[in-house]
């Protein structure tokens, strides 16, 4: 099995990931591994010579680039934060800051915007990936409530008065918790009619 550089008449190389076709000499040459770049191009008698990317630069893939890409920080003005640093083998890894979602995508997220508030009685539907889309608010399920306008507040279960040795004074709704009272306390006047029944 031929090792680069080797002649190729059909302009294709056996290992597309790690080799490339050099048209000037009609040969297949080695690409440089991630974290390196081409410091000397190949010829018929000599394979590609690779060198390590300098500090603050990277190449992510097997390549035949003559330079490394400059590391760039995540742009906080665009609502992005850093989750992993740039290394010679990968670019800086960014994501939307907490409370934001990706509003513009071009191979990666370029711009984040604030998540919409979910009104009382609802909560944001949980997504597989945080920051991927805006909130989709869904009603609290039975026996739960949520009493704020917030992008992140979750519906909480209604308080069970009996667990605290109390009795229910007013039932919970989707927007409010159960109101409990001491069993010895009289009911407020507006509710005494219901009690008599």
């Amino acid at each position: 099995q031929a090792v680069p550089p080797y002649a190729s008449e059909n302009q294709t190389c056996r290992d597309q990931e790690k080799e490339y076709y050099e048209p000037q000499h009609r040969i297949c040459c080695s690409r440089c591994p991630p974290g390196t770049y081409v410091s000397a191009k190949c010829s018929r008698i000599r394979d590609t010579v690779c060198a390590t990317c300098a500090e603050n630069s990277y190449n992510e893939h097997w390549n035949y680039l003559t330079i490394c890409q400059l590391c760039r920080p995540c742009d906080p003005v665009m609502g992005l934060e850093e989750i992993a640093p740039c290394t010679s083998k990968r670019k800086t890894q960014c994501r939307c800051q907490p409370g934001m979602f990706c509003a513009a995508w071009a191979l990666e997220c370029t711009h984040c915007e604030l998540l919409s508030d979910c009104p009382p009685g609802t909560e944001a539907e949980l997504k597989d990936e945080v920051g991927k889309g805006n909130n989709h608010c869904v009603p609290c399920k039975a026996g739960h409530f949520q009493n704020t306008s917030s992008p992140s507040a979750r519906c909480q279960p209604h308080t069970r008065c009996e667990n605290q040795g109390l009795v229910e004074a007013a039932p919970g709704t989707a927007q409010s918790d159960t109101t409990c009272k001491n069993p010895l306390e009289p009911l407020p006047p507006e509710m005494s009619g219901t009690m008599l029944m």
Epitope: G35, P73, A84, P85, T87, S88
Partner: antibody, heavy 116, light 107 residues
């Protein structure tokens, strides 16, 4: 050559704040991240956060969020780390360090003692 | 946060010995691991980055290996100046985390 020179030792009382400086030279200050790492007596190393002087944006370890502020002055190529609401367990040597696949460059360290 | 568990916490060895220190990450960190040497009262010194690349000026007796979750620092023939504390560090994701250190003492 790259040099990071830190300010001198500090003695503080619980509840006070401390601000440590780190003056960089020998490279372009605005294009490299500067981190802060601390080491309590006889303990391991603990990463606190970083600043990218190019856009003066900082990011912190959640453990210190709200208590630590990292800033930078581009005109003097100096980074600062301020830690507030000090407690005795903040007694440590505080280092600034420039990163690239680890920390190849470190300041000499600043000892901060918190004692009543 | 990613935990870096280093072992042993201390070891006694003689000049000329081969010394191995291991570091285990709580999740996959690729090859994004560095090793440092620290002497009392001094800042740590970078020995190895990208798990196995010796930093410039570091003697060839120091070598690193591993990827994913298991990493090793080896000193092939311990020299008098190597008695120090060694730390591993992951720089794969924030927050960066360090191992608790291994103190190499004279037997």
């Amino acid at each position: 050559q790259v040099q990071l020179v830190q300010s001198g030792a500090e003695v503080k009382k619980p509840g006070e704040s401390v601000k440590v400086s780190c003056k960089a030279s020998g490279y372009t200050f605005t294009t490299y991240y500067l981190h802060w790492v601390r080491q309590a007596p006889g303990q391991g190393l603990e990463w606190m956060g970083w600043i990218y002087p190019g856009n003066v944006h900082a990011q912190y370890n959640e453990k210190f969020k709200g208590r630590v502020t990292i800033t930078a002055d581009k005109s003097t190529s100096t980074a600062y780390m301020e830690l507030s609401s000090l407690r005795s367990e903040d007694t440590a040597v505080y280092y600034c360090a420039r990163s690239w696949e680890g920390f190849p460059y470190w300041g000499q360290g600043t000892t901060v003692t918190v004692s009543s | 946060d990613i935990q870096m568990t280093q072992s042993p916490s201390s070891l006694s060895a003689s000049v000329g010995d081969r010394v191995t220190i291991t570091c285990k990450a709580s999740q996959n960190v690729g090859i994004n691991v560095a090793w440092y040497q620290q002497k009392p009262g001094k800042a740590p010194k970078l020995l190895i980055s990208s798990a196995s690349y010796r930093y410039s000026g570091v003697p060839s007796r120091f070598s690193g290996s591993g990827s994913g979750t298991d990493f090793t620092l080896t000193i092939s023939s311990l020299q008098p100046e190597d008695f120090a504390t060694y730390f591993c560090q992951q720089y794969d994701t924030y927050p960066f985390t360090f191992g608790q250190g291994t103190k190499v003492e004279i037997k």
